[in-house]
Structures are given as C-alpha cells and as structure tokens.
Amino acid sequence: QSSERRVVAHMPGDIIIGALFSVHHQPTVDKVHERKCGAVREQYGIQRVEAMLHTLERINSDPTLLPNITLGCEIRDSCWHSAVALEQSIEFIRDSLISSEEEEGLVRCVDGSSSSFRSKKPIVGVIGPGSSSVAIQVQNLLQLFNIPQIAYSATSMDLSDKTLFKYFMRVVPSDAQQARAMVDIVKRYNWTYVSAVHTEGNYGESGMEAFKDMSAKEGICIAHSYKIYSNAGEQSFDKLLKKLTSHLPKARVVACFCEGMTVRGLLMAMRRLGLAGEFLLLGSDGWADRYDVTDGYQREAVGGITIKLQSPDVKWFDDYYLKLRPETNHRNPWFQEFWQHRFQCRLEGFPQENSKYNKTCDSSLTLKTHHVQDSKMGFVINAIYSMAYGLHNMQMSLCPGYAGLCDAMKPIDGRKLLESLMKTNFTGVSGDMILFDENGDSPGRYEIMNFKEMGKDYFDYINVGSWDNGELKMDDDEVWSKKSNIIRSVCSEPCEKGQIKVIRKGEVSCCWTCTPCKENEYVFDEYTCKACQLGSWPTDDLTGCDLIPVQYLRWGDPEPDYKDDDDK
C-alpha cells in the first residue's frame, strides 16, 4: 500500500456514503514521507469494511427505512494517518465536484459538445475516520463542501467545537467524560501521585490536558507528563520507560491517555527492560479491551485498568462475517490480502498473491479461529444507521408522500442533511438510544476493564465496573484480591501526630517531608506549627494549647528537687 495506487471498495446505490477505515496500520516513521501504509488490520480495518457493506445490505432490505432508495458506499483506507486520509478525502471531494458540475451542465467535451459520460455519484456524507487527529484534518476539508461527517471512535474534546467543526458528529462521547472517569478511578484508590503519558496527536493531547486539569482540582499530583507517537521507534519507548522508572517507587500508577499502539509500544519496552509488574497502567479507551494491544506481552499488561466505551458485541455481524471466504468475497478488495496475512499463507491465483508466505492456504481455514469482534463495532454500525435515518427524515420532510428520491433531494443539500442528522434519534444496535446534543456528541457510558491473569499463562480482560454520566461503580474485590494488595502511588506518606508537612522548594504539593513541632508548639494546620502563648502548653494530641495551672508554693511545701546537668 503506497501512495501511488489506492484501492477503493464500491457498492452501487442511489445515494453514496463515503467511509474512511484504517484498513492498514499507519506508515512507520521511515515510510511516512512516501505514505506507505503498514500491515493490514482485522478489527479496525477489514471488520469495519465488512460492517459497512453488510449494514447497507440490511438497510436496503428494510422496507421501513428509505423505501425505494438504495444506499451505496465508497470505502477508502485512512491508514490511521492524516496525510493518507486527506489524500483519500480529496478523492471524495473530487467526485462530488465533478458530479455537481455535471448536474449543472458544466461538463463539456474538448470539442465543445456535451458529455454523455456519467461520472460517479457524489458522496453525501462520510463515516469515520477512527483517529481524532485524522478526523480533524478530514473535517477541515469536508466542511468546506458541506459534507456531514459521522465518527464512530474519534472522541477528542476539540471536535465538540461547532464553530470549528460544523459538519462533524459522532455516535461516541467526548473525551472530557472519560478523563473524568479516569480521575474518579485515581481518586477512588487514593493515588495522589501518578505519572502521565499520552499519544502525540489530538486524541492524546486534549484527553491528557483534561485529565491533568481535573486531577489538579482533586489534589492529584502528576509526577511528570510525557508524550510519544504510536509509531515511535524502540529507543524512544525505551527512553520513556526509563524516565517513568525514575519516578519509582513513588509514582507506580501511569495514567495513559493513549492509542492502543502506544500502549503496546510501552509494553514491548517493559519486556526489553525487564520491568513487568513495576507499574499499573491506567489506560483510556484507545486500549479498552483490545487483544492486539496485549498479545505476546500479557505479563507486562497484567493489572492494567482500562476505560472502554460501552458497546456489546453485535451478534448478527458475526453471523455474517464468520462465513466470509476469499474465493467468494470479491466486493472487498482488501480481503485476499487480509486472508493471507491472517493465516500466514499464500492464496494461489489471486491478484494479491503474496510470495512472502511459503505455505498455500488450506481450504479448511475459517475466520471462526481466534475470532474477536472489533470492540467498536456497535459504534461503526450506529454511525451508518445515523446517516440512513438522517437521510430518511430528510426524505420524509422534502418528499412527503413520495417513495424514493424526489427532485427536492437532487442533489442532496449537505446543509439540510446536517440539520436532519442533528435531530435524528433512534434505537441503536445494542438497544440504547442514539441521539446527538447541540455539539453533535453522544452521551457517555463506559465500562471499566481489568487485565488479569486468570490461570497459568491465561490472561483476559474482565469487567470490574462502570462509569455512567458521572457515577463510578467499581467491584474492588475483583480488582484487588486483598485490601493490602491495593497499589500505593503516593509521593509522601501522611505525617505522624505532632508533625507538619514541609514542601521542598520546586516540589509538587503531594511531596513533603514531615517535621515535628518544637516542644512548646502545636499543629496549627498541616503546614504550620505555632508556639503556645506564655503560660500555656501544647495538649497531648498537639492540636492546641492548655493553660498551665498556676501552683503557689506555701511555707510548709517540700523544697523543689533540682537536677544538675551532669546528673544521669
């Protein structure tokens, strides 16, 4: 997959919806300039392509949704990379521009005669892409042409700003909510001193900024904050891990507002440096419950607590997907490449035959083996349905009593479609209500996951809690087998009775040394000792002063005992 030739998946229809999926991994650092994408992806790529194709089939066969109108699509590969996604979005725009000029009779042949050539239908809206940074770049382009965009996993808070991103909507909540959920977890376990890492790019940067702001308000100190690109080299991850290690044993918890591949980079560095078990990673939904993040590095990931957008598996998708085979699936142009990559074998006689695999693919191979559904599948499907319902409502309003596309919908006006989409609400694929607020965002519901060793060499994610509209629920016994096992991530231990905190110059407020008050002083507040006034003395608990009772000597009293300094 290089920049010269890009593959596209087409499905014909009366209305065409564009989609950007990360069919391949992002280019590695050395391949960025030529926009050469990485290996093919299953969950984030192929499964999403198939979800789009099959969801449109379901919509088209539903007599109550867009009757007499067929939805088609054009799916392009974003490679989880801004430059690639922009290049692909320009292709969407180009089709639209040619189509609208043709609609207005502006397409003429060189000799001046009118053209009988019919170009592709314009894209009415775009589903995706997955990454926030990439979605921002794509939105900057799409909004110039009034093309609505519905995202299924771009959660950056910046995208809520409708003055900047007017044509952007999403079926997922803004990251402000998961930043709050992460802070609530940190608070729950009294972690007051944590390290912070985020993926360079909009998702990580804005998420971590929110996490840090909220932490400061809650009295949580950040030992140090670091950033790294997901595709950074081994040495960069090693250096980062060594820096995190320098804050041990105090900052055991590492809050990671990170893409999944950033977390994987950290786990791999932990393996190389022999650091498994030294940190507890608290990860955002970029990690969630993905096995492609932890595979091969389970020992390093054990104990990790992650945030996952609430989205149950979609059964009907698996029923469809698991039956797919390379000899019959021709509408997905990446499928043969994926099949060969998934089973590390060669499909003979296919245009995408891969000579790097020695063995030929066996006909008994099936996708059922080690199948894991994309954790965001429900959101991908909901985004597609949102577009369909938006178009349906628009058709009902512009073409009353008419089945199909009436003239009022030719060509489709992006402004009117956006208006219709913003008012859309329907029951999503998992039975929850899908609706959009004034910023085009959806409500926030998260599951809290914990990556655990379930048995010898068997690891898995288990659900240990939830965060729903500001309320955190956690099953502490599931996370920590004993109270004493709760990890401590504090800079300084509480001071003993009669001691005050002295914060060293340049240190954060969570780091102090404990100093006892002088003999005649009491603890005024946690940072100050105050001397008792003459004639009074500190109380036993050193919280105040008591008057010293005055004792008058009478003639008959025995003489007071005096001790010499050299008396032992």
Epitope: E234, K242, G274, L275, G277, E278
Partner: antibody, heavy 121, light 106 residues
Amino acid sequence: QEQLVESGGGLVQPEGSLTLTCTASGIDFSSGYFMCWVRQAPGKGLEWIACISPYSDNTWYANWAKGRFTISKTSSTTVTLQMTSLTAADTAAYRCARTMAIGAYNPFKLWGQGTLVTVSS
Amino acid sequence: ALVMTQTPSSVSAAVGGTVTINCQASQNIYSNLAWYQQKPGQRPKLLIYDASDLASGVSSRVKGSGSGTEFTLTISDLECADAATYYCQGYYSGNAFGGGTEVVVK
C-alpha cells in the same frame, strides 16, 4: 554501609539440590532495585542466572536456568536461589548482585563476595 | 537470546600504553552495555554503564564507546593496577556477559 552476603554453598552430590541465601544489609529493598544471582565457574567468566523485583516478586531467568533454578524473596532483606538437578557444570562461585536501576536488565552496581558450590560425587 | 562476544581473550601492553577491548552483541542493544573489572579473588567492579557513562569513582583514563552491536573499552596511560580481567555485559531483552578479556600490564 551497603553490603550483600551469600551463604549456603558447599559440596553437593550430582542430581542433588541446594538453596543459597543472599542477605542484604544497609540496603532498603523498598527503593525498588532488583536482586539477582550471577555465577562464575572456576577460571571462567560471569554468567547471569536470574533476577527478582522486590516490589512485585516477578522473576526473570536466563533461558538455561528456567525450570532448575528458582529465585525468591524470603524477607525484606533476603533473597534465595533454589537449585535442583545439579551437575558438575553447575560448580561455580555464586554471587548475589543488586541492579543499578529498577528493572531486571541493568548493570550490577553492588556485588557479594560469593559462595562456592561444588557438585561432585 | 542475547549473546555477547568479547575480543581478544587476552591482551598485554606496557605501563603508560593503551589497550582496546571489543564487545559484539548478537542483536541491536542500542547503548545498553556495561563494562566491569575483576581482579583475582575479588568481586566485579562496575566501570562503565550505558556504553559510555563512567561509574562513580572510576578513573577518566577508562573510556567506553559504541552503540548498536559494536562496543569498545579503551584504557589509556596503563598502570600496574589495571591488570585484571574485563567483562562486557549487554542488558537489553536479557542479561548476558562477554567471555572476558585478561589485561596484562608489563
């Protein structure tokens, strides 16, 4: 003063077992530095065996040592090395060492004097 | 597994001279390499870590260089007290020592 002292070495029969102990003094295990075992056969070079994290009790082994050698932390100041199925090739001075930084793969800053293990019938 | 190959196995030089010891890693270990000095009957002493950083109390006559798979220890202005066996250690995805180099000072 920081010090590591090994004990438990001696003569052992082939196929026999032995447990070595490393006692640390003047060292705060809570600082997180890893404790390791390195051996040296007479007149030969150094050979890393295993390391343990005093915090998590996680262990790391050289491939050849897996299965026969077990490193463990028995208290806040002692680390042991259990050795089984010993052969003449295991005859060596066994040294306890502390890493320079946190992590199993690190230079060794502090070394014990060593305890000699002789495997012979 | 990580393997460290040290050359030569023995080297001799006159007082005031210079010796160079090489160490090769079986895989890229970046700068994760240490050098030790060991005298007969004594425990090893850390000289260099992270390929070129001098451990505390070590003479500036000792210099480490290299990265990736090729590393060098250079001792200049040799003194009689430098006579010892020197070991390299790679510490990346494992710990491994080189076979050692005996330095004889004439």
